[in-house]
Interface confidence: low
C-alpha cells in the first residue's frame, strides 16, 4: 500500500520565523510529476494544491499568500516540503498533507506558535513630590504573561500590570506593568515576564540612575505653570510698588476680599 | 485502532430535540474534523455539518437553524444536537472522521438509529 | 446543492467481470483542476466505507481491482474482477461545493 510518512508530527517555531514541515512519499526511479497530486491544508484554509506539475496559486488562502511555497526541489527526493515565512500566530493549527501517487495517503502535523517576551522596554521616573520611583516594563508576546517584580536581595514585590491587544497583530498580548517604589541610587530591580511552560522566562534589569530627569508629565505641569507663575509675580510686583505710593488700603481690601471669598466669607464681612 | 462510538436514544417525540454523543479513540479531536451525516430511506445520506479540529463549526444550511455541534477535547467527545425533530428526520445518523483535508469520511461511527414518533 | 445522479440503480454482474457504476453532477465538482468525488461502499447493517477519493485515488487498503475515473461532472467507479465480497450499495460524494452531497446508490449483485 501506498503510505506516506513524517519525521516530525509536530513543529514548534516562533512568530516571525521560518518553517519547513515535511511529509515523505515512496518514489521509485524517477518522479513522474504529472501522476504525482500534493495537497498541503490546515482545516478549512488550501495552501498548496500541486497538480499535473504546477501549484496552483489561485487555489491558496489568502492568509498564506506569499509566505508558503512547495520545495519544488524535494519532491525529486520523496519529500513534499512546505514552508512558510514569517510565521504568524494564527498559522497555529493542524495541516494535513495529501499526497496522491499512483495510492493516495495523508498524514497531519501540528503546528505551535509561540513568540517569548524578548524584547523588553523598561522606563524609570521620579515623583519631584513624593520622591518615589515608577519602573516600568513593557513587551510584546503570546501567550499571555504575568510580570513578576524582584530585588536584588530576592524579595518579590507587588506591580501593577495591564494586558492589552498589540497593535501589529490581533492575537499578540501588549503587556504593561509597573513598580511604585522608594529607592536609592544604584538599587536593582527585576522585572519578569512568566508565561506557563519551561523556561518561558524573559527579564530585564532595572538600576535606579543617580539622577533623575524630570518626567515628560512633570515638564508640562511646569509648562502650564509657567506663564500663570509669570502673572502672579507682576501682580505681586505692582501691589509692592501701590504700597509704597501710599494707596495700598484700597487694593489691599480688594485684594484680600478677592482672594478669601471662596474660602473664609465671615473674614470678608468682618474686614469691610 | 481509530474507532466512533455513538449514544444516544432511539426514540424522539416530534418537535422535541435529538442528542448524540460521539465517543472517539486512536486519534485526536484535535488534530480531525468530525462530520455527521444521516441516512433515511426516502433522503438517502446526507451531511449535516462539521466541527474542525481548531472548534470552528460548518453546517448544512438546510439545517443550522436547529443544529449545534459542540466537542470536548479532553474526554473526546463529540456532541450533535437538532432541534425541532419531525418524523422525517427518521433516519440513521451518523459520525465520521474528516479525512485528508477534510473532502471526505475516512472512518463512521457505529451509527445511532433514531425514530421520531408519538 | 449540486445534484448526484447515479445510474444504473441496480447492477448485476458475473464473478470475475467488470462492473461499471456511473456518477454525474448537476454542476462541476472540480476544486481548482481537483475533481473533488469520493466513492464508498456500503454493506447491510454497517456504515458506509470510503473506497476512493479526489475521482482516482485508492484509499490505502482497498483492494488494487477497484478503481476511479472522471472529471467535471462525469465520473466512474469500476470494479475488475468482481468478486463475491464486493456485494453492496455503492454512492458516491461530492466536495466540490458545501454542502458535501451524495447520490442515491447503486446496489451490485451477483448473477
Known amino acids: 500500500a501506498f503510505t506516506i510518512t513524517v519525521s516530525k508530527d509536530l513543529y514548534v517555531v516562533e512568530y516571525g520565523g521560518n518553517v519547513t514541515m515535511e511529509c515523505k512519499f515512496p518514489v521509485e526511479k524517477q518522479l513522474n510529476l504529472f501522476a504525482l497530486i500534493v495537497y498541503w491544508e490546515m482545516e478549512d484554509k488550501k495552501i498548496i494544491q500541486f497538480v499535473n506539475g504546477k501549484e496552483d496559486l489561485k487555489v491558496q488562502h489568502s492568509s498564506y499568500s506569499q509566505r508558503a511555497q512547495l520545495l519544488k526541489d524535494q519532491l525529486f527526493l520523496g519529500k513534499a516540503a512546505l514552508q512558510i515565512t514569517d510565521v504568524r500566530l494564527q498559522d497555529a493549527g493542524v495541516y494535513c498533507c495529501l499526497i496522491g501517487y499512483g495510492g493516495a495517503d495523508y498524514k497531519r502535523i501540528t503546528l505551535k506558535v509561540h513568540a517569548p517576551y524578548r524584547n523588553i522596554s523598561q522606563r524609570i521616573s521620579v515623583d519631584p513630590v513624593t520622591s518615589e520611583h515608577e519602573l516600568m516594563c513593557q513587551a510584546e508576546g503570546y501567550p499571555e504573561a504575568e510580570v513578576i517584580w524582584t530585588s536584588s536581595d530576592h524579595r518579590v514585590l507587588s506591580g501593577k500590570t495591564t494586558i492589552t491587544n498589540s497593535n501589529r497583530e490581533e492575537k499578540l498580548f501588549n503587556v504593561t506593568s509597573t513598580l511604585n517604589i522608594n529607592a536609592t541610587a544604584n538599587e536593582i530591580f527585576y522585572c519578569t515576564f512568566q508565561r506557563s511552560g519551561p523556561e518561558e522566562n524573559n527579564t530585564a534589569e532595572l538600576v535606579i540612575p543617580e539622577r533623575l530627569p524630570v518626567p515628560a508629565s512633570e515638564r508640562t505641569h511646569f509648562m502650564i505653570l509657567g506663564p500663570f507663575l509669570l502673572l502672579l509675580g507682576v501682580v505681586l510686583a505692582v501691589t509692592f510698588c501701590l504700597k509704597k505710593h501710599g494707596r495700598m488700603m484700597d487694593v489691599e481690601k480688594c485684594c484680600t476680599r478677592d482672594r478669601n471669598s471662596k474660602k473664609r466669607n465671615d473674614i470678608q464681612f468682618e474686614e469691610t | 485502532q481509530v474507532q466512533l462510538k455513538q449514544s444516544g436514544p432511539g426514540l424522539v417525540q416530534p418537535s422535541q430535540s435529538l442528542s448524540i454523543t460521539c465517543t472517539i479513540s486512536g486519534f485526536s479531536l484535535t488534530s480531525f474534523g468530525v462530520h455527521w451525516v444521516r441516512q433515511s430511506p426516502g433522503k438517502g445520506l446526507e451531511w449535516l455539518g462539521v466541527i474542525w479540529s481548531g472548534g470552528s463549526t460548518d453546517y448544512n444550511a438546510a439545517f443550522t437553524s436547529r443544529l449545534s455541534i459542540n466537542k470536548d477535547n479532553s474526554k473526546s467527545q463529540v456532541f450533535f444536537k437538532m432541534n425541532s425533530l419531525q418524523a422525517d428526520d427518521t433516519a440513521i445518523y451518523y459520525c465520521?472522521?474528516?479525512?485528508?483535508?477534510?473532502?471526505?469520511?475516512?472512518?463512521w461511527g457505529t451509527g445511532t438509529t433514531v425514530t421520531v414518533s408519538s | 446543492d449540486i445534484v448526484l445522479t447515479q445510474s444504473p440503480a441496480s447492477l448485476a454482474v458475473s464473478l470475475g467481470q467488470r462492473a461499471t457504476i456511473s456518477c454525474r453532477a448537476s454542476?462541476?465538482?472540480?476544486?481548482?483542476?481537483?475533481?473533488?468525488m469520493q466513492w464508498y461502499q456500503q454493506k447491510p447493517g454497517q456504515p458506509p466505507k470510503l473506497l476512493i477519493f479526489a475521482a482516482s485515488n485508492v484509499k490505502s487498503g482497498v483492494p488494487a481491482r477497484f478503481s476511479g475515473s472522471g472529471s467535471g461532472t462525469d465520473f466512474s467507479l469500476n470494479i475488475h474482477p468482481v468478486e463475491e465480497d464486493d456485494i453492496a450499495m455503492y454512492f458516491c460524494q461530492q466536495s466540490g461545493k458545501v454542502p458535501h452531497t451524495f447520490g442515491g446508490g447503486t446496489k451490485l449483485e451477483i448473477k
Open positions: 454542476e462541476s465538482v472540480e476544486y481548482y483542476g481537483t475533481s473533488l
Open positions: 465520521a472522521r474528516g479525512g485528508g483535508p477534510d473532502w471526505y469520511f475516512d472512518v
